[in-house]
Interface confidence: medium
Amino acid sequence: GITNINCSGHIWVEPATIFKMGMNISIYCQAAIKNCQPRKLHFYKNGIKERFQITRINKTTARLWYKNFLEPHASMYCTAECPKHFQETLICGKDISSGYPPDIPDEVTCVIYEYSGNMTCTWNAGKLTYIDTKYVVHVKSLETEEEQQYLTSSYINISTDSLQGGKKYLVWVQAANALGMEESKQLQIHLDDIVIPSAAVISRAETINATVPKTIIYWDSQTTIEKVSCEMRYKATTNQTWNVKEFDTNFTYVQQSEFYLEPNIKYVFQVRCQETGKRYWQPWSSLFFHKTPETVPQVTSKAFQHDTWNSGLTVASISTGHLTSDNRGDIG
């Protein structure tokens, strides 16, 4: 933003320093320089002298007019040409901003990731405002009527320790900037209903010899939630369409899921879980790759997530790293 300077006059913007993008605006510059009747007043935008749409109003004041101003930010200053002065004399400067009022925040979602100790609330902020926009998240206990407010620029993490007004809450979001304010609908939550189990992870895969070769995917989660429903999706890397298998899971031991897959094809697997009967899913796990052997395997071997593998009695893929899934939108 603008830093403190000693002005020899005044610069102001109509209708305001922050205004709606696309508006017509006027910037006024009024000189107050000792022993100087300005011959000329100059306006600079981002350091470049403006040539057009400048009107001299009186001996000390000039106006610069912009039609349909679309720049999100500009630094303006004005100078005067004084008689007997070799250089232009600085009058004053101002930062101006254009943007939009906030949209109504929607899709307000609050979840508690198991072991995180936080309730994470997110929302769709709508179109880009271009100007500083703040969000106030209101959390009101339906049992005690106590209301807490949290100021943020994006999402918010609220410590579950601070949610001491029971289990039921109303959550809503207010968006505000210099051009307007909007408020979301209220979301009613029950803390027990919004827990997302600890992430499920695929650890390895193997294709074993049988009448029809089958691939076993090993996967696990550190969750302490007893009733968990999971989905595993898989596809050949050359395909667009996913196949999905559903499981009711007990994570007291590592899960083994069997698949009958085509030979000599690279497959990708992902898994996600939710507490059975609840609303929110985990995001899909990292991509896990496994290539099936060419024909019925003969000898034992291991392979990693990459393409390297040897045909054998057991063809294995071991998770050695994580490629981030792009499916974070599956929470809702």
Partner: antibody, heavy 121, light 112 residues
């Protein structure tokens, strides 16, 4: 004569903040803009931002969330602050005076010698 | 952001020969006021950059007349008519028409 002198910490730990001072002499803030530029070892120049004579600031948007440029006119100093530093912020940081041609052409006519900043644990 | 692409990356020239460096912009550098704010800098080994040419073709004070700039719109050229030993270093083009200001990647001039 015109001089610009940068002073910085030299070594900064990752995730920490950087503060560099540019002390100028031989000209007035009210006539010239001051620009900050950095140059990673063996690489090209990257524009960080400019402090205009009117006191306004334009930032490189890619870095704006981590950058603050300010000044203390009484001490003829301009400040660059950058937070959440990572190893790829290792560079020589320059301040430069912007010479304004009569039509407002800002080209950097005088540069400081730069201050080397290494981000490392 | 405006991307400035310089070519060649390196230039090997014999003393007394001519050298030519190109700078191409991803967008026109003509400002709405009609001016083109394209500048050239030279950074000698171990030194800060120095201004050579401002606004396409204007030599900065103290810059020898063997340096000349030309071009318009998106294509610009810096020429050194007779290369001297003191000219070696990295040449950068830069634009200040649009914020953020940007620099080209640099052209290293080396003596054969």
């Amino acid at each position: 004569d015109v001089q610009l002198q940068e002073s910085g910490p030299g070594l900064v730990a990752p995730s920490q903040s950087l503060s560099i001072t540019c002390t100028v002499s031989g000209f007035s803030f009210n006539t010239y803009a001051i620009t900050w530029v950095r140059q990673p070892p063996g690489r090209g120049l990257e524009w960080l931002g400019v402090l205009w004579p009117g006191g306004g600031i334009s930032y490189n948007l890619a870095l704006k969330s981590r950058l603050t440029i300010s000044r203390d006119s009484s001490k003829s100093q301009v400040f660059l602050e950058m937070n959440s530093l990572q190893t790829d912020d290792t560079a020589r940081y320059y301040c430069a005076r912007n010479w304004r041609h009569y039509d407002g052409s800002y080209a950097m006519d005088f540069w400081g010698q730069g201050t080397s900043v290494t981000v490392s644990s | 952001d405006i991307v400035l692409t310089q070519s060649p990356l390196s230039l090997f020239v014999s003393l007394g020969d001519q050298a030519s460096i190109s700078c191409r912009s991803s967008q026109s550098l003509v400002h709405s006021n009609g001016n083109t704010y394209l500048h050239w800098y030279l950074q000698k080994p171990g030194q800060s950059p120095k201004l050579l040419i401002y606004k396409v073709s204007n030599r900065f004070s103290g810059v020898p007349d063997r340096f000349s700039g030309s071009g318009s719109g998106t294509d610009f050229t810096l020429k050194i008519s007779r290369v001297e030993a003191e000219d070696l270093g990295v040449y950068f083009c830069s634009q200040s028409t649009h914020v953020p200001w940007t620099f080209g990647g640099g052209t290293r001039l080396e003596i054969k």
